[in-house]
Interface confidence: medium
């Protein structure tokens, strides 16, 4: 397996470096974070991507003026966006 | 406190079989991949084979040098990964540990080990 | 199959030295690799994972470095209780381990 790779980036653009994963992981994980007040005011936006062993969580969460949303895939550099 | 522990080993004539089990405990074995390495006296570390879980169907995954004759399984109501070996060979005369990775803390190696068990494969 | 070429086979160094062990794979496996630390009769230790991570409980003076295929472990200030076997492996494709370095006391 081989998935995008970054970390606390702002931009997809920063997040196009693949990486090989081990042969412990089944999944390429993004991670998309961000702050704001409905979609009026927004305080920052963070985009994470990894190789992972398991799907952290299956859908968004939201807690209070934060978001963040997580989600997963299996084949071949597959979490591009 | 995470335990491995291997039985089942001794000795066995050439083209003999023998099954090796590992208890584990201190985590939560159906979550994680199960493996086996094993150790010719005075040798280095050779991978034996691996099992993942449920989700992915029990995949497994064999070292060329034992693929076709050994075989792993696991019982995850008991805790235990099983190496079935089968058409043994002097070769295959080593001190075989189970090996669990440790997913906790983001950690997939082989973070956990028994204290292994020896086979010895001689007429 | 990946193969995981480690060099030195053996060293001896005294209390104190910088200790450096590399280790060399066939094709490129990313970041995977990780340490291990074997004392006789022992099953072996994690010491690093995914090339340059220090595993719980791991003094700081083990370190290790790089990518791709070349990949360099090191203990800064050597100690007595360091004596024992060292292992590369990686995980990128099955898992392949290096020979070993047994690292002795001068």
């Known amino acids: 397996l081989m998935c995008f790779s970054c970390l606390n980036q702002k931009s997809n653009l920063y997040c196009l470096k693949p990486t090989i994963c081990s042969d412990q992981d089944n999944y390429c994980v993004t991670v998309s974070a961000s702050a704001g007040i409905g979609n009026l005011v927004t305080f920052g936006h963070s985009l994470s991507k990894t190789c992972s062993p398991a799907c952290p969580i299956p859908e968004g969460v939201n807690v209070g003026v934060a978001s963040m949303g997580i989600s997963c895939c299996q084949s071949f550099l597959c979490n591009f966006s | 406190e995470v335990q491995l522990v291997e039985s089942g080993g001794g000795l066995v004539q050439p083209g003999g079989s023998l099954k090796l089990s590992c208890a584990a405990s201190?985590?939560?074995?159906?979550?994680?991949?199960m493996h086996w390495v094993r150790q010719a006296s005075g040798k280095g570390l050779e991978w034996v084979g691996r099992?993942?879980?449920?989700?992915?169907?029990?995949?497994?995954y064999y070292a060329d040098s034992v693929k076709g004759r050994f075989t792993i399984s696991r019982d995850d109501s008991k805790s235990t990964v099983y190496l079935q070996m089968n058409s043994l060979k002097t070769e295959d005369t080593a001190v075989y540990y189970c090996?669990?990775?440790?997913?906790?803390?983001?950690?997939?190696?082989?973070?956990?080990w028994g204290q292994g068990t020896l086979v010895t494969v001689s007429s | 199959d990946i193969q995981m070429t480690q060099s030195p086979s053996s060293l001896s160094a005294s209390v104190g030295d910088r200790v450096t062990i590399t280790c060399k794979a066939s094709?490129?496996?990313?970041?995977?690799v990780d340490w291990y630390q074997q004392k006789p009769g022992k099953a072996p230790k994690l010491l690093i994972y995914k090339a340059s991570n220090r595993y719980t409980g791991v003094p700081s003076r083990f370190s290790g470095s790089g990518s791709g295929t070349d990949f360099t472990f090191t203990i800064s200030s050597l100690q007595p209780e360091d004596i024992a076997t060292y292992y590369c492996m990686q995980s990128s494709t099955k898992y392949t381990f290096g020979q070993g370095t047994k690292v002795e006391i001068k």
């Open positions: 099992i993942r879980t449920k989700p992915v169907n029990y995949e497994t």
């Open positions: 094709q490129n496996v990313g970041s995977n």
């Open positions: 201190g985590f939560t074995f159906s979550t994680v991949a």
């Open positions: 090996s669990a990775p440790n997913y906790y803390d983001g950690t997939y190696s082989f973070a956990y």
